[in-house]
Every structure is written in structure tokens, then in C-alpha cells.
């Protein structure tokens, strides 16, 4: 390994030997989470006994990323606590590579391989112990730590059970060969959460899929609660850096959420891209097309690089309830090119939703079926009715100009009016399909500033029901 190890403090002619001194394994057992000096060292069995290492239990290795502070941040403390709460008998090992991570980013990147090798050597040594199985090992790496986990999985003798990449670092890893970054070959199951990907500027998190399943919450870019306004509102001197930290670190908090809020699991849905997901096209659970996220993600027989999407709340618990809405807009009059703004309110047996906007990803198709994605933060129960509202002041200047011109050339100004007979709804979480019809079949038209009510008239869409995620997973 010709990498520089300690940003000038130590050079790596002796690579792994130098790294050995720069990487510590801090065992955090549930019996004594605050216990000091619980450091594991290859070849030294005493700490395993002293610190109650359970050879037959699951073993988690948490690997931090680049640091500017030289300390282990609070996300790590939260993750350790959450793992100990969920898996009471498990061994939780924090991989402390601060000496190499508290350097220039480029130097830290150059150290990831040698730190991965150090983790692999620890795992190889543990494999020699009675009862220890590599299949029980779960490496969890955040940012640069995700690639360290990848290298560890690549170098270890055998196959690690699972690697979770929490927003793996993008710079210097995007687009590189699989042996130079986290990849599906590094463990039996590699699941990844991407929360800070950007197609413009620097993408702190890697954009490309690097695991068996790659989950992109909220499209993998703008995370709710992390906007500049949110950050400025809660931080005395909010900065772009705070937004970056919020979005990048969101991956960790989603994982923590999956550990502590077992009763509110979030589901992600397979989709080719974010735009199609935003259109509501991808809410299927057939053929492993949906999965739990974070700790609850299940290994599927799918081939690698499955991209999955979901929406989330701004804070814990992050779970939302996804609905696909199919609406056929009939147009009997010459309405021209319109850009209507529609809102829906869903009414269920448990609660009613807030007023939800129907996001038009491209353009409304007239005399065609349009698909939308809406999501609610609360569990509405079984849906009973839907109120659809067409906002009154949604006309663009272009629309107004067209109408003015058509008014001059025609005796009657064309009405902006559409007709909707029914709304078909599918719940992502339950996979139930329902049809909602207008109360009076004679009154199906809606114009700007008006509302239409739809009541449940049919279970299903006259199609075979799909399996629900709760059954499948």
C-alpha cells in the first residue's frame, strides 16, 4: 500500500503496520456501554473476555467517515445506543480511525483501503475463535466509512453477512471501478441509503448505485427539514454547511429510526428513476419490488443495483403513507394548454389528511389517465372519500395571454373546465386498490376555484390484488 497514512504524520512504506496503530476497535457491550478502555486488538484474547464479547451473537462494526473535529460525532452515539436497544446480545464495535480521518479529505480517501484492510485483519482473527461466524457480521459505514466497509468486505477471508452504506462518500468514488469503492461483491448483502446526491455542484454522497439495493429517500437529494429555511430557523447562525450535514447525516438517522421505531417501518419501492417515482408509477410490491429500509431491509433474490425510492417525514419517526392516484381528465371543450393546480384531501376511518398538492411532474394529459403520488404523515386507516380542489388562481401569464387572444378571435370565451368521473387509489403500504366515484354521475365537471367529492365505490380496480409488503417481507 503506497497510500499516505497520516497526512504527513506518518508515511506508508509499512502501510498496514502504520495503519494498525491508527485504527482502534472500541467494543461497546450492552453490559457496559460507557466502559473505558474496551479496545480489541488482533492477537490479544483477554479484552474479548474482559469486555464480554459474545462469539455466537451478531457483531456490528460501525465505521465513521472523514472528520473535521477529531472526535466521534453524536450520530455514532445514537447509532450505538439504537443497536444495543434492538439487538441486546450483539457486539457493537466502533472502528476508530480518527488519526487518518482527521486529515485533508484527499488524504483520508487515500487511507480508506488500508483502514479496510485493518478491519479485515480483525475479522480474520475473530474467525479463528470458536463460535464466531462471518455471516453474523454487519458492517455499517457512514460516508467515507462506507467505502472502508467495502474494502474490509473485499479483503476479508470469506464473505461478510451484510454491509450497510449510509450515504457513501461521492468525491473520488463516483464512477470508479468496483474494486476502488463499495460494491455488491463486498458482502452477501449490501444495502445503501443515499440522502445527499446532487447532479449539480459537488455531490457529497455517491449518486450511482453501489449495492444490491440502493434506496434514495426523497429522491436522494432534498431532505425534508434540511432546507436552508429549516436550518436557519433552528440554528442561530445557520449555514449551507449545516444543510449539507443535515442531508448527509439523514441516512444515519433513517437507519436509527428503522432500529428504534420497529412499529413504524418505512417501505421503499423499486423504480427506474426519481421522476417516475414522483409520478406515482412505482408503488408495487410484486416480485420483490418493495422492501423495508435501513435495518429492516431484507436480502432479495434480485440482481444487484436495484434503485428504490420513498418519501419521508422531516423527523423521527420518518414513515409516511404513500398513495398512487390515477385520474382520467376528460376535456369536452377547447381548453388549450392548461397548467391546473389540484389539491386533494383524503378522509379515512382514523383521520383526514392535510390538503395535499398533486405534483405535476411533466404536464397534465387531457383525455388521458394521469398518475400522481401523494403521501400522508398520519395513518388515515381505510379511505372513505376524497375531496379534489382545483385552485382558482393557477393560470400562468401565458394562459391569460392565450385566453385574451382567443377571446378577441371568438365570440365565446372558452371555459377552463374538466370532467373527472372517478379516482383510482392504491396504497403503497397495504397494496390495497380502491376506486372512488363522484356522488352524482351527472355532476363530474370541475373548473378553477371549484371542488369535487369522490366516495369509495369499489374495492380494487377490477384487477388482481397485489401482495402487501407486510406479507412479502
Amino acid at each position: 500500500a503506497e497510500e499516505q497514512l497520516e497526512g504527513g504524520l506518518r508515511t506508508a512504506k509499512d502501510g498496514p503496520a502504520a495503519a494498525k496503530a491508527a485504527v482502534r476497535f472500541h467494543l461497546r457491550t450492552s453490559k457496559g456501554p460507557e466502559r473505558e478502555g474496551c479496545y480489541l486488538s488482533v492477537g490479544h484474547s483477554q479484552p474479548l473476555e474482559d469486555c464480554s464479547f459474545n462469539m455466537t451473537a451478531k457483531t456490528f462494526f460501525i465505521i465513521h467517515g472523514w472528520t473535521m473535529s477529531g472526535m466521534l460525532e453524536n450520530w455514532l452515539h445514537k447509532l450505538v445506543s439504537a443497536l444495543q436497544m434492538r439487538e441486546k446480545d450483539a457486539n457493537v464495535v466502533v472502528v476508530d480511525w480518527l488519526p487518518l480521518a482527521h486529515q485533508l479529505y484527499t488524504d483520508a480517501v487515500n487511507s480508506t483501503r488500508v483502514v479496510g484492510l485493518s478491519v479485515a485483519k480483525m475479522l480474520d482473527w475473530l474467525q479463528g475463535k470458536d463460535g464466531f461466524s462471518l455471516g453474523n457480521v454487519h458492517l455499517i459505514g457512514y460516508s467515507l466509512g462506507a467505502h472502508v466497509a467495502g474494502f474490509a468486505g473485499n479483503f476479508v477471508k470469506g464473505t461478510v453477512g451484510r454491509i450497510t452504506g449510509l450515504d457513501p462518500a461521492g468525491p473520488m468514488f463516483e464512477g470508479v471501478d468496483i474494486h476502488r469503492r463499495l460494491s455488491p461483491d463486498d458482502a452477501d448483502f449490501v444495502d445503501v441509503l443515499h440522502t445527499y446526491t446532487r447532479s449539480f455542484g459537488i455531490s457529497i454522497g455517491i449518486q450511482m448505485p453501489v449495492g444490491h439495493i440502493d434506496i434514495y429517500p426523497n429522491g436522494g437529494d432534498f431532505q425534508p427539514g434540511c432546507g436552508l429555511n429549516d436550518v436557519l430557523g433552528s440554528i442561530a447562525y445557520g449555514t449551507i454547511a449545516e444543510v449539507v450535514k443535515c442531508e448527509h447525516e439523514r441516512a444515519v438517522h433513517l437507519f436509527v429510526d428503522s432500529l428504534v421505531n420497529q412499529d413504524k417501518p418505512s417501505f421503499a419501492f423499486q423504480c427506474t428513476d426519481s421522476n417516475r417515482f414522483k409520478k406515482g408509477i412505482c408503488l408495487s410490491c410484486r416480485k420483490n419490488r418493495c422492501n423495508g429500509i435501513g435495518y429492516n431491509a431484507k436480502k432479495t433474490r434480485n440482481k444487484r443495483n436495484t434503485k428504490m425510492y420513498l418519501k419521508t417525514r422531516a423527523g423521527m419517526p420518518f414513515r409516511v403513507y404513500h398513495y398512487q392516484m390515477k385520474i382520467h381528465f376528460f376535456s369536452y371543450k377547447s381548453v388549450g394548454a392548461i397548467e391546473p393546480t389540484f389539491y386533494v384531501t383524503l378522509y379515512g376511518t382514523n383521520a383526514e389528511s392535510q390538503v395535499l398538492s398533486l405534483e405535476i411532474v411533466e404536464q397534465i394529459g387531457l383525455n388521458a389517465t394521469n398518475t400522481f403520488l401523494v403521501y400522508t404523515e398520519e395513518d388515515l386507516g381505510d379511505l372513505l372519500k376524497i375531496k379534489l380542489t382545483w385552485e382558482g388562481t393557477s393560470r400562468s401569464w401565458y394562459d391569460l395571454w392565450r385566453e385574451f387572444r382567443s377571446y378577441l378571435s371568438q365570440p365565446h370565451r372558452p371555459e377552463r373546465e374538466l370532467s373527472i368521473r372517478r379516482i383510482r387509489v392504491k396504497s403503497g403500504e397495504t397494496q390495497r386498490r380502491l376506486t372512488f366515484c363522484v356522488e352524482d354521475p351527472e355532476k363530474t365537471s370541475i373548473a378553477p376555484g371549484q371542488e369535487l367529492w369522490f366516495y369509495k365505490c369499489r374495492d380494487g380496480w377490477r384487477m388482481k390484488n397485489e401482495t402487501s409488503p407486510t406479507v412479502e417481507l
Partner: antibody, heavy 120, light 107 residues
Framework: EVQLQQSGPELLKPGASVKISCKAS????????IHWVKQSHGKSLEWIGH????????NNNEKFKDKATLTVDKSSSTAYMELRSLTSEDSAIYYC?????????????WGQGTTLTVSS | DIQMTQTTSSLSASLGDRVTISCRAS??????LNWYQQKPDGTVKLLIS???KLHSGVPSRFSGSGSGTDYSLTISNLEREDFATYFC?????????FGSGTNLEIK
């Protein structure tokens, strides 16, 4: 028993420099970080910065970036803070405190404090 | 930086009293709140970490509570050695910051 023993009081002239020491005992020096805290007369506490004795990595409060330099001598389990270009504003009690390597760890043991007086 | 506010700078109480000292953060600090006691001779001791976790050797009459931005330290049965100055400190975000202190004096 964990102990942090700080050097004695200092009386210096403006413009001078001073190096305060903090000798740790009763625990493995490299397992924790050492932090420095300033308390001006009758005022609150201000975090100056920290050093990780394991590898010598430091991080200072922006306010003290040009004022304080933190170092360690692992062989004697001693941490040092050098304050330069002293002014009357630097007159205060300076504490060293031990903290785990996690942000979330508290300052669990403190030195007795070193009184610095800067006067012409 | 996160501002830590201890609105009561001074508090008078009698032996055996129950007193509560409050501390407010300028933003949510996720329970990363520690309490320290400073004696008149300058000695500083940790009392409580992570909002409510009693440090080893600290008497059980000390307790901490709170969440979000509002936290408090309660001393249930005041003893003579408890008359001192109490500081809160957040460990959520760098730079670490302290409250201005509450001086507890004997009535």
C-alpha cells in the same frame, strides 16, 4: 483514581507567551481527549479546544484559533496549552478537562485550574 | 454557536429545601446536556450527563430532566456542601458552550 494536575499560577506582561501543563494519571491517557476551558473573572466558562492524545489531532474554537496551541507528550501523559501574544483579556483561570472521544461524552474530570494574570 | 441561557444567576435557599435550576438552549440539543458544580475554591465536578445520567459518586438527591431546548437540575434535599455555582453545557454541536451559571447561596 483519575486526576488532572495543572501547573501553578502565572503572572506575565502583555505580549508574552505562556505554556500551561496538565498531567493526567489514573487512566490510559490515549483513551480520552483533553479539553481546555477558560473562565474569566466572575464569568462563565468558554471552551477553547481539544486534543486527542492518541494521535495529536486538535480542534479549536474559532475564537481561540490564533491564541491557543495544544500539544501532548504521551510519554509523560501530559497535555499543554500555549497562549501567545497575551493581553489583559487573557487574564483568567484555565482548566483542562478529560472527555471521551465522543461528542456526547461529558467533561468527567477537571484539573484544579491555572490562574493567569496579564499585567504591565 | 448554540447559546445556553441560565436565567437565574443567583438563588437563595435553606438546608433541606428542594431547588430547581433551569437552562435553555437556543436550539434543540437532543438531550446532550451536562451539569457541573463549581465550588468557591474553583474546583469543578461533573454531576449529570446526557440530561439525567448521574455521574458516579454523585449523591442521588441530584437529578436532571428536560428535552429539546429546556432542561433543569433539581437538588431535592439541600445539604451544606451543595451551596456552589452550577453550570449547564451542551455537547450537541461544536463549539461546546456553557450557561452563565447559577450561584446557589445559603438563605
Amino acid at each position: 483514581e483519575v486526576q488532572l494536575q495543572q501547573s501553578g499560577p502565572e503572572l506575565l506582561k502583555p505580549g508574552a507567551s505562556v505554556k500551561i501543563s496538565c498531567k493526567a494519571s489514573g487512566y490510559t491517557f490515549t483513551d480520552n481527549t483533553i479539553h481546555w476551558v477558560k473562565q474569566s473573572h466572575g464569568k462563565s466558562l468558554e471552551w477553547i479546544g481539544h486534543i486527542n492524545p492518541y494521535y495529536g489531532g486538535t480542534n479549536n474554537n474559532e475564537k481561540f484559533k490564533d491564541k491557543a496551541t495544544l500539544t501532548v507528550d504521551k510519554s509523560s501523559s501530559t497535555a499543554y496549552m500555549e497562549l501567545r501574544s497575551l493581553t489583559s483579556e487573557d487574564s483568567a483561570i484555565y482548566y483542562c478537562a478529560r472527555k471521551g472521544i465522543y461528542y456526547s461524552s461529558p467533561f468527567d474530570y477537571w484539573g484544579q485550574g491555572t490562574t493567569l494574570t496579564v499585567s504591565s | 454557536d448554540i447559546q445556553m441561557t441560565q436565567t437565574t444567576s443567583s438563588l437563595s435557599a435553606s438546608l433541606g429545601d428542594r431547588v430547581t435550576i433551569s437552562c435553555r438552549a437556543s436550539q434543540d440539543i437532543n438531550n446532550y446536556l451536562n451539569w457541573y458544580q463549581q465550588k468557591p475554591d474553583g474546583t469543578v465536578k461533573l454531576l449529570i450527563s446526557y440530561t439525567s445520567k448521574l455521574h458516579s459518586g454523585v449523591p442521588s438527591r441530584f437529578s436532571g430532566s428536560g428535552s429539546g431546548t429546556d432542561y433543569s437540575l433539581t437538588i431535592s434535599n439541600l445539604e451544606r456542601e451543595d451551596f456552589a455555582t452550577y453550570f449547564c453545557q451542551q455537547g450537541n454541536t461544536l463549539p461546546f458552550t456553557f450557561g452563565s451559571g447559577t450561584n446557589l447561596e445559603i438563605k
